[in-house]
């Protein structure tokens, strides 16, 4: 922590400017008035302060705003944002997309994923929902950031906004997030024709249930292997060999390459070897001929 000293008269600060570049940490602590700093935050980003000096300036703001910074200060944090922890950001109330844009720009190229995720969360809370303007801002300034939001926050996305989401924005989404987004996407694209619908829904299919995947297998969509590999394990396991063959079309040959990887490996274990052999791919590990399959989970439920 910076030691407290009194400010020498000749070092008193009346405005935030270049003259502060060479102040020592204890001089900044003693001589910079926190209210002046807050009022002139827009100037800080143009001054080549060192890491240590920025620590002092952050400390002064923390003392002035223990409950969290006001948005007028947050908007002008600039490089000082790089000093913020997720705990700091959780105290903020942010509603302006200009503020979000400014801070996303600053964070580019820095390891700030936790802070950015928290910031986006605060924006969604502040604005009440994940509206189209927010999604547009995220896709433009922070591809992949949509997936930093919790499933709870994503549940506030209106289906009408889903069209603004690009495939690359969903690359880092986990199954729980796709579980939330998929039904919204299904609703958003329901009036599209078969092929157009598949192109649109494809990035969201990691959240699709078995019945929807089965339905797709009847539509000659020729699903690529990458999309198939992202399907929920639970959605793939009940599919028959015939359904998978129809679903993948010419891409079915790719199953051999993915034979050892989930969900393909798990799916193979559930199929009769006879049925797998009909694909002519040499897939091994299916249930041998003549074996009886007992579903123990059903028996336990009955007892």
């Amino acid at each position: 922590d910076v030691e407290r000293t009194t400010c020498p008269p000749e070092k008193e600060v009346h405005e935030i400017d270049e003259s502060l570049i060479f102040y020592k940490k204890r001089e900044l602590e003693a001589c910079v008035d926190a209210a002046l700093l807050a009022a002139q935050m827009d100037r800080v980003d143009a001054i080549p302060f060192t890491y240590e000096q920025l620590d002092v300036l952050k400390h002064k703001l923390d003392e002035l705003y223990p409950q969290g910074y006001p948005e007028s200060v947050i908007r002008h944090l600039g490089h000082l944002f790089l000093k913020m922890s997720p705990e700091d950001i959780r105290k903020w109330n942010v509603t302006s997309l200009e503020t979000l844009k400014a801070l996303l720009k600053v964070s580019k190229g820095h390891e700030m994923s936790a802070q950015v995720a928290t910031l986006i969360d605060r924006v969604v809370v502040g604005r009440g929902q994940l509206d189209k303007d927010t999604v547009d801002t995220l896709t433009a300034f922070c591809p992949g950031c949509l997936c930093s939001l919790s499933p709870e926050r994503l549940s506030s996305v209106p289906p009408s906004v889903i069209g603004a989401v690009r495939p690359q924005d969903l690359d880092t989404c986990g199954p729980r997030q796709l579980d939330v987004l998929y039904p919204k996407a299904r609703l958003a694209f329901q009036n599209m024709s078969g092929s157009e619908y598949f192109v649109k829904i494809r990035p969201f299919l990691g959240g699709a249930p078995t019945e929807d995947v089965k339905a797709l297998s009847q539509q000659n969509v020729s699903m690529d292997l990458a999309t198939f590999m992202k399907l929920r394990r639970e959605a793939v396991l009940p599919l028959t060999v015939a359904e998978v063959q129809k679903l993948l079309g010419p891409h079915v040959e790719g199953l051999k390459v993915e034979e050892q990887h989930s969900p393909v490996r798990d799916w193979i274990l559930k199929q009769r070897q006879d049925d797998l052999d009909t694909l002519g791919l040499g897939l091994q590990g299916g249930i041998p001929n003549g074996y009886l399959i007992l579903d123990l989970s059903v028996r336990e439920a009955l007892s």
Partner: antibody, heavy 119, light 106 residues
Framework: EFQLQQSGPELVKPGASVKISCKTS????????MNWVKQSNGKSLEWIGV????????GYNQKFKGKATLTVDQSSSTAYMQLNSLTSEDSAVYYC????????????WGHGTSVTVSS | QIVLTQSPAIMSASPGEKVTMTCSAS?????MHWYQQKSGTSPKRWIY???KLASGVPARFSGSGSGTSYSLTISSMEAEDAATYYC?????????FGGGTKLEIK
């Protein structure tokens, strides 16, 4: 070991520009500000300006505003100074010098780059 | 800007002799830094924050002062100390250097 390796001597014509480099090694380039200092033939030293390599923010001596432009390339840990509209007054040795921790003077200096302006 | 005046401009000392050079500031400064420069080489940080010796600087060197008056002292001159010494402040913007004191060996 810390090193600030400056580019070689320059002989330039009046009115021209020159860009000199300062390649650093042995420390985290973005953690310390880089200063530039002018020394005219054996005379005293003049501070030109400072750049924060992490953010690219700069501070200049009023006397050198418009004359010097400071930049950095983080990928190569190199600082640059461009001098414009050169006159004989700009003939000097120019040093890059790392700013010490918490304002503790300029702790490491480059070997200097001699710039001679002559027609 | 603050003007730093060093005196004397040139001085000479015999080996073993005590040497003191001064740096006077036109306005009060909080710290003074000193650099040593030998002919044809770049300056080296020598004393910083008024009295702290830089790494590798012999203990015969010391710095002191406050306000507008600062000094560098060598308790016992040695031949390797012959050089030009510059004082520098960055308490006030922009940073400035003194004109230098050239120390020669007798």
């Amino acid at each position: 070991e810390f090193q600030l390796q400056q580019s070689g001597p320059e002989l330039v014509k009046p009115g021209a520009s020159v860009k000199i480099s300062c390649k650093t090694s042995g420390y985290s380039f973005t953690d310390y500000n880089m200063n530039w200092v002018k020394q005219s033939n054996g005379k005293s030293l003049e501070w030109i300006g400072v750049i924060n390599p992490n953010y690219g923010t700069t501070g200049y001596n009023q006397k050198f505003k418009g004359k010097a432009t400071l930049t950095v390339d983080q990928s190569s840990s190199t600082a640059y100074m461009q001098l414009n509209s050169l006159t004989s007054e700009d003939s000097a040795v120019y040093y890059c010098a790392r700013g010490g921790y918490d304002g503790e003077a300029m702790d490491y200096w480059g070997h200097g780059t001699s710039v001679t302006v002559s027609s | 800007q603050i003007v730093l005046t060093q005196s004397p401009a040139i001085m000479s000392a015999s080996p073993g002799e005590k040497v003191t050079m001064t740096c006077s500031a036109s306005s009060s400064v909080n710290y003074m830094h000193w650099y040593q420069q030998k002919s044809g080489t770049s300056p080296k940080r020598w004393i910083y924050d008024t009295s702290k010796l830089a790494s590798g600087v012999p203990a015969r060197f010391s710095g002191s002062g406050s306000g507008t008056s600062y000094s560098l002292t060598i308790s016992s001159m040695e031949a390797e100390d012959a050089a030009t010494y510059y004082c520098q402040q960055w308490s006030s913007y922009p940073p400035t250097f003194g004109g230098g004191t050239k120390l020669e060996i007798k």
